[in-house]
């Protein structure tokens, strides 16, 4: 028998420095978690103690804090090189700055292989990107070799900016021939490493013949066996065992997100490469694990360039700004309300006495809200805090839509409610009531919108044939998160101001903020 230790991270989202327990900015260092300096300590400890160790990342290192805003991926390559990652799969967010924003800072600078079997380049890009990422890698570990096949969410064109010269194929269809090649090479221990979410991870384990282990990302899934060490509630045991169609037990793992945990999986293989046993758990990277001094010193050196972003106070909050995915992807969250209020405020244009304003409505995909802000840091809100909440460098745009399109959008918002997906809408100038007992596509039971052609704003039922102005992220205007109906049916689209700037201007103007959850989004069961 031969034992392999797989250390894995996913969805780190630019959390190079340690963070608070909810993965926002570290306030009380003694209670902070994660960060690359702490991760390195744990990785080195395991490398010293165990013979056959692989350190893998399942994508979405890009995007999430001021580090990415300023360094644009150079920080990812630098610190992943320092930690000596063995391989990485491309995530959807690796394309947020376009293909060039992936090639130059990361693909050309990483000292480790970067993988995806289901992304195929075409046209002029094919030769430019050739060899910079690979479908598979054979990694020598001790006296054995381990095959790693990569995959990336085929939804990436809807979630990011990969351009028109990359084709994202079905994961299973693309993976099988690459695994077959590895088998031909007599590589009999194969890990699928990728970024398509837990459901796809399980499907890959079930359907792709020859895959022994699946290391995933994208859905921020927390798996744990036993009593979990922090706030995250396990979605299942670690590893999650899937029985493949050919009768094998395939362990599937993921390690939550934001570098809070280091996935730790021990696999025992027989001489033919069959998995005999698998066990482990994510390791919580809390303050009991010291930060490595040399990596910490390097972080501090790189940090200098960020300080002018982070020191300036824009305003104060006297309430917790709940931007957690657990709230904003499931219900009304006060961070969503704050952002929508800022978006409307930024578009106040009193040009006609018939209208108190030309626009009253805002919609915002919950998945676009990437971090909370803790008020216990003296209430201070900085640009850096906002960059963690709104890290994508998008714009808040003005569109004109028919009521029928908006109705479709709100149905889409909850068509697969409960899976922590990003399309759940936060709102401003809208009151919506959902009945989740009804079938998808028929769950919106009340949709009232704030009038604009009125001296005293009030909520009136949405009219299907009326044309409304709506402020929304450019991501939604472009059909992101599956909102194809917006892209296809919008009647006018004017691009607006940078998202962080809109919110920072609003906070500066208000000085002190205290957004509430106030019943903009409600759930009910029964008749209306």
């Amino acid at each position: 028998a031969w034992e392999l230790t797989i250390l894995h991270t996913n969805d780190v989202h630019s959390r190079l420095e340690q963070t608070s327990e909810d993965s926002s900015k570290c306030v009380n260092a003694s209670r902070c978690m994660g960060g690359v300096a702490r991760l390195f300590t744990k990785v080195q400890q395991i490398r010293r103690a165990e013979p056959n160790v692989l350190l893998l990342d399942a994508g979405d290192q890009y995007q999430g804090t001021i580090w990415f805003t300023v360094y644009k991926g150079a920080e990812v390559a630098h610190f992943m090189n320092a930690l000596r990652y063995d391989a990485m799969a491309l995530g959807n967010h690796e394309f947020d700055n376009g293909v060039e924003g992936l090639i130059e800072p990361l693909l050309k600078e990483a000292k480790f292989p970067i993988l995806s079997a289901n992304i195929k380049a075409k046209g002029p890009l094919a030769s430019q990107i050739s060899g910079l990422y690979l479908p598979y890698k054979v990694l020598p570990v001790g006296d054995e070799v381990v095959g790693i096949v990569g995959y990336t969410s085929k939804e990436t064109p809807f979630l990011s900016n990969p351009g028109t010269n990359l084709v994202f194929e079905d994961e299973i269809t693309a993976l099988q021939p690459e695994v077959d090649k590895l088998k031909t090479l007599n590589v009999n221990k194969i890990i699928a490493l990728g970024h398509s979410g837990f459901e796809m991870d399980k499907l890959i384990a079930q359907k792709v013949r020859g895959v022994d282990v699946v290391v995933g990302g994208h859905s921020n899934t927390f798996l744990y066996t036993g009593n979990p060490p922090s706030k995250e509630v396990p979605a299942g045991k670690y590893p999650f065992i899937v029985t493949s169609d050919d009768g094998r037990k395939v362990p599937v793992v993921q390690a939550y997100a934001f570098g809070k945990y280091l996935g730790y999986l021990k696999i025992e293989f027989d001489e033919r490469g069959n998995v005999i046993s698998s066990h482990g758990n994510p390791i919580l990277l809390n303050s009991s694990i010291p930060e490595d001094p040399s990596i910490k010193a390097d972080i501090n050196k790189w940090r200098i360039k960020l300080d002018n972003y982070s020191t300036q106070e824009l305003g104060k909050t006297i309430v917790y700004l709940d931007g957690s995915s657990q709230s904003c992807r499931f219900r009304e969250c006060n961070m969503g309300n704050l952002i929508c209020d800022a978006m409307i405020n930024n578009n106040l244009r009193h040009t006609d006495e018939m209208f108190w304003n030309h626009v009253s409505m805002c919609i915002l995909n919950g998945g676009g809200i990437r971090s909370p802000i803790d008020e216990r840091n003296n209430g201070t809100i900085t640009w850096e805090n906002l960059a963690a909440v709104l890290p994508f460098g998008g714009t808040f745009d003005l569109v004109q839509l028919k009521g029928s399109t908006l109705k479709k959008a709100f149905e889409h918002s909850v068509h697969r409610y409960g899976q922590s997906t990003g399309e759940f809408l936060q709102v401003g100038g809208i009151h919506v009531v959902y009945d989740l007992s009804r079938k998808p596509g028929d769950r919106v039971v009340k949709l009232d919108v704030l009038c604009t052609k009125c001296r005293v704003p009030s909520y009136d039922p949405l009219k299907m044939d009326e044309v409304y102005k709506v402020i929304l992220p450019n991501f939604l205007a472009n059909g992101g998160d599956g909102f194809q109906m917006i892209k296809d049916e919008l009647l006018r689209h004017d691009s607006g101001d940078q998202d962080i700037n809109v919110v920072s201007t609003y906070i500066s103007k208000m000085k002190v903020i205290y957004p509430a959850v106030e019943g903009r989004i409600k759930f009910s069961t029964g008749s209306h």
Epitope: D86, K108, E109, A110, K111, F112, P113, S130, G131, L134, P135, Y136, K137, V138, L139, P140, V141, G142, K181, T184, L185, N186
Partner: antibody, heavy 119, light 107 residues
Framework: QVQLVQSGAEVKKPGASVKVSCKTS????????IYWVRQAPGQGLEWIGW????????KYNEKFKGRATLTADTSASTAYMELSSLRSEDTAVYYC????????????WGQGTLVTVSS | DIQMTQSPSFLSASVGDRVTITCKAS??????VAWYQQKPGKSPKLLIY???TRHTGVPSRFSGSGSGTEFTLTISSLQPEDFATYFC?????????FGQGTKVEIK
């Protein structure tokens, strides 16, 4: 573009050792295997072994185990092949090479280094 | 060790001819076969890998086929620059081995 440039020709006496270098450029050295192949005059090709500069692991053709040593210097993006206890039948052109996809054919080759073993 | 036996060892042909070189493996190697072209005093050049995949920049007149134990390299219309020695190689099992070569000469 990918380039592999090897050190110059060597003449060695039987029993001696030779160390051939292979300086790479145009790609990230630590991400690809370096393979070593030799070709005796007028003969076919013979695989010696590989090194993975990402973690310095090596694999040798049993025929060369104990005599060939493959190393890499990542700071110089250079691979080395040392062959000891040289005999006349080791007279050959020694090549380093790199693949496109792991193992699947040697896509990029050095220009070759002629090692002559003669008393 | 897996033996890779090429045939013919020598081949005389004219420009425009269709040329086929075969390679037999002493045991199955699936499709883990590469083909190389080598000219005197030069390093080998990769033509085909995975038995049938053309390497970047290789003209479409070169094609490879086969799996298991029998493989062929076909040059659909021989060009003056194609006169060289061709080698097959298996990379399925260690030690990786090459065929003895097929020299394609001008008739």
């Amino acid at each position: 573009q990918v380039q592999l440039v090897q050190s110059g020709a060597e003449v060695k006496k039987p029993g001696a050792s030779v160390k051939v270098s292979c300086k790479t450029s145009g790609y990230t050295f630590t991400r690809y295997y370096i393979y070593w192949v030799r070709q005796a005059p007028g003969q076919g090709l013979e695989w010696i072994g590989w090194i993975y500069p990402g973690n310095f692991n090596t694999k040798y053709n049993e025929k060369f185990k104990g005599r060939a040593t493959l190393t890499a210097d990542t700071s110089a993006s250079t691979a080395y092949m040392e062959l000891s206890s040289l005999r006349s039948e080791d007279t050959a052109v020694y090549y380093c090479a790199r693949d496109v996809y792991d193992y699947a054919g040697f896509a990029y080759w050095g220009q070759g280094t002629l090692v002559t073993v003669s008393s | 060790d897996i033996q890779m036996t090429q045939s013919p060892s020598f081949l005389s042909a004219s420009v425009g001819d269709r040329v086929t070189i075969t390679c037999k493996a002493s045991q199955g190697v699936a499709t883990a076969v590469a083909w190389y072209q080598q000219k005197p005093g030069k390093s080998p050049k990769l033509l085909i890998y995975w038995a049938s995949t053309r390497h970047t920049g290789v003209p479409s007149r070169f094609s490879g086929s086969g799996s298991g134990t029998e493989f062929t390299l076909t040059i659909s219309s021989l060009q003056p620059e194609d006169f060289a020695t061709y080698f097959c190689q298996q990379y399925s099992s260690y030690p990786w081995t090459f065929g003895q070569g097929t020299k394609v000469e001008i008739k």
